[in-house]
Interface confidence: low
């Protein structure tokens, strides 16, 4: 008799892949646009890279550290009016993106949250809540919340608002935080929040390091459900070697929980390569024609349009990883079980129940390392296999598809691979 | 197709200003990156500076207290001053419009006018 | 500013034969872009992004490169190949050009 199926868990969109944030609309589109009706024109390239959801703005109007002059219920008009905003949100929904607004209220000024009048604001928060549910958003982000005095009571406040509306409805919280034990008194207090924070900002240095990191998260916030980023708002590539990029992107996408990535992430877009740009908002590269200022200094293999002709690409990799981490049970909601590798490696398994199931196995170092996976740290219920299938390699020239013996198995520097077994009972 | 033709006097005093127009046809100067360049007698090019489909200009550092670009859009001309000339500014005068588009490369010139500096 | 040196400054060769010419950077650049003029004509763009060839340039030039060190190469020289190539950058400005190679028929 077939051993009975596991019961699903109850699964929320943001489970299902990715979030995608664009916080300057302006440097997002470039080319002196950045409005909501020339953002709608993007969405079919949110959608070839198969994220859940949208994190936009803020784009209410702010005066600088003005909160007479700071509405959370208008748009900026330099962004476009609410029917653009209108707009914009039916095209996403056609689309199967949700969009979630940035609501963070001095987002031009000084102290996000007008330190002096923190009441005033939790006040116009909460009326602006009420009214964008009712406008068809999908949920909400607030940043910078540890310059919000008692943020634990006003978020949870806020997501009674939002749950209340329904629970469907997500909100997002973002803190410069790295601190595990401030992390997790914010998480205590607010149930089905997501919170992004710099927790995994300083994860660059080793596979040993990043492991102790991930599984002391996992292991502090037990089964709630978590979000990867390396910061609230910036780029990989501020915290990253160019070289431990792909390594991320299938670490982020692979760790059971949501991946939040800021627009540029997948293809590597990196303000210090674009001079003059804002290291927070750099222009995103397109094509060539993007960064005009300094002519040659864009390459296309920096660019969209050049890296979607070539398969090999970091954006190629990214729509990959989002393609799978959306579609296959063990990636969406899948048991996680860390184990040793060996020095400079981070190895994990994924699995649910009779699905098949993926090995990850990355390579910090820079150098070459034959990997010593101990099974024995693994449960009976995750044990590996002789040999597993490469799914895919965060470096050219492997044969994709192809049986790989687990005790033989060695990586190139900064490699990244997933790899396929199915279960066996 | 693009074309781009340089006017202006062939012949100007030292200290005085040399002024040249690019006449441009076949595109806007509303897009894209309008240069000058100047070839001296011995052959080297220089890079004298631009103005921008925005109307920004860069001026070569070597040449920035003299040099100035404009531009009438309703003309679809731009402009060349170049101040306080000596003998040493005598070349031929390019404009030019390069357009560098993911594997494309265009540079389209005009034909260039020898400017003599002279008393 | 970035400082192109081309060389050499003239040379001439006969038909058939290979001709290289050299162009070195002062920095690292991404790109070598390539120019030919004749006499009493413009400039001409003849080789992009190092090694493409613009439209209508014969497949014997061909050009290669990276960092500071880029060169372009005709591999069999023909009568019509007489006339003087500037390398030029993008990579920052004030864009910079070679001082030319004069390349004569023997």
């Known amino acids: 008799r077939a051993p009975r199926c596991r019961e699903l868990p109850a699964q929320k969109w943001w489970h299902t892949g990715a979030l995608y944030r664009i916080g300057d609309l302006q440097a997002f589109q470039g080319h002196g646009a950045g409005n909501l009706a020339g953002l709608k024109g993007r969405l079919d390239y949110l959608s070839s890279l198969k994220v859940k959801g949208l994190v936009l703005g803020p784009i209410h109007k702010n005066q600088k550290d003005d909160v007479a002059q700071t509405d959370l219920l208008q748009i900026d008009p330099n962004f476009g009016s609410k029917e653009d905003f209108d707009s914009l949100l039916q095209s996403a929904k056609k689309k199967s993106i949700r969009v979630i607004l940035d609501l963070t209220p001095n987002y031009r000024g000084e102290n996000s949250w007008f330190s002096t009048q923190v009441d005033t604001v939790a006040t116009k928060v909460k009326d602006a809540l009420e009214f964008w549910l009712q406008a068809g958003v999908d949920g909400f982000q607030v940043r910078d919340i540890e310059n919000l005095k008692d943020a634990s009571s006003f978020l949870a406040e806020w997501q009674n608002i939002t749950k209340g509306f329904s629970e469907d409805r997500l909100l997002i919280a973002g803190t410069n935080s790295s601190d595990l034990q401030q992390i997790l008194s914010l998480l205590e207090s607010n149930k089905d929040l997501l919170l992004t924070s710099s927790y995994l900002s300083d994860s660059g240095s080793t596979g040993e390091h990043t492991k102790s990191l991930v599984t002391q998260y996992l292991n502090a916030t037990g089964n709630r459900w978590c979000s990867w980023s390396l910061s609230q708002a910036r780029l990989l590539t501020s915290f990253l070697p160019a070289q431990l990029l792909r390594l991320y992107q299938l670490m982020l996408f692979t760790l059971p929980g949501t991946p939040v990535f800021s627009y540029g992430d997948e293809i590597g877009l990196d303000a210090a390569a674009l001079p003059g740009q804002p290291m927070e908002a750099p222009v995103m590269l397109w094509d060539e024609s993007s960064f005009p200022d300094i002519p040659g200094a864009v390459s296309a293999n920096m660019t969209v349009k050049g890296q979607s002709e070539d398969p090999g690409s970091l954006l190629s990799l990214f729509r990959r990883l989002s393609d799978q981490r959306s579609k296959e049970r063990s990636l969406l909601h899948g048991d996680f079980h860390a184990f040793s590798a060996g020095p400079g490696l981070f190895s994990y398994i994924r699995h649910w129940d009779q699905n098949e199931r993926f090995l990850v196995v990355l390579n910090f170092g820079d150098v070459g390392l034959s990997a010593g996976l101990q099974a024995s740290d693994l449960p009976a219920s995750a044990s590996l296999p002789a040999k597993a299938d490469l799914l895919l390699s965060t470096q050219p020239g492997r044969e994709e598809g192809s049986p790989l013996e687990l005790e033989r198995l060695k990586l190139e520097p900064h490699e990244g691979l997933l790899l396929r077994f199915p279960y066996a009972a | 197709e693009v074309q781009l033709q340089e006017s202006g006097p062939s012949l100007v005093k030292p200290s005085q200003t040399l002024s040249l127009t690019c006449s441009v046809t076949g595109d806007s100067i509303t897009s894209g990156y309008w240069n000058w360049i100047r070839k001296f007698p011995g052959n080297k090019l220089e890079y004298m500076g631009y103005i921008s489909y925005s109307g920004r200009t860069y001026y070569n550092p070597s040449l920035k207290s003299r040099v100035s670009i404009t531009r009438d859009t309703s003309k679809n001309q731009y402009y060349l001053q170049l101040n306080s000339v000596t003998t040493e500014d005598t070349a031929t005068y390019y404009c030019?419009?390069?357009?560098?588009?993911?594997?494309?490369?265009?540079?389209?010139w005009g034909q260039g006018t020898l400017v003599t500096v002279s008393a | 500013q970035i400082v192109l040196t081309q060389s050499p400054a003239i040379m001439s060769a006969s038909p058939g034969e290979k001709v290289t010419i050299s162009c070195s950077a002062s920095?690292?650049?991404?790109?070598m872009y390539w120019f030919q003029q004749k006499p009493g004509s413009s400039p001409k763009p003849w080789i992009y992004r190092t090694s493409i060839l613009a439209s209508g340039v014969p497949d014997r030039f061909s050009g290669s490169g990276s960092g500071t060190s880029y060169s372009l190469t005709i591999s069999s020289m023909e009568a019509e190949d007489a006339a003087t190539y500037y390398c030029q950058q993008y990579q920052s400005y004030p864009l910079t050009f070679g001082a030319g190679t004069k390349l004569e028929l023997k």
């Open positions: 920095s690292s650049v991404h790109y």
């Open positions: 030019q419009r390069h357009v560098i588009y993911d594997y494309t490369w265009f540079a389209y």
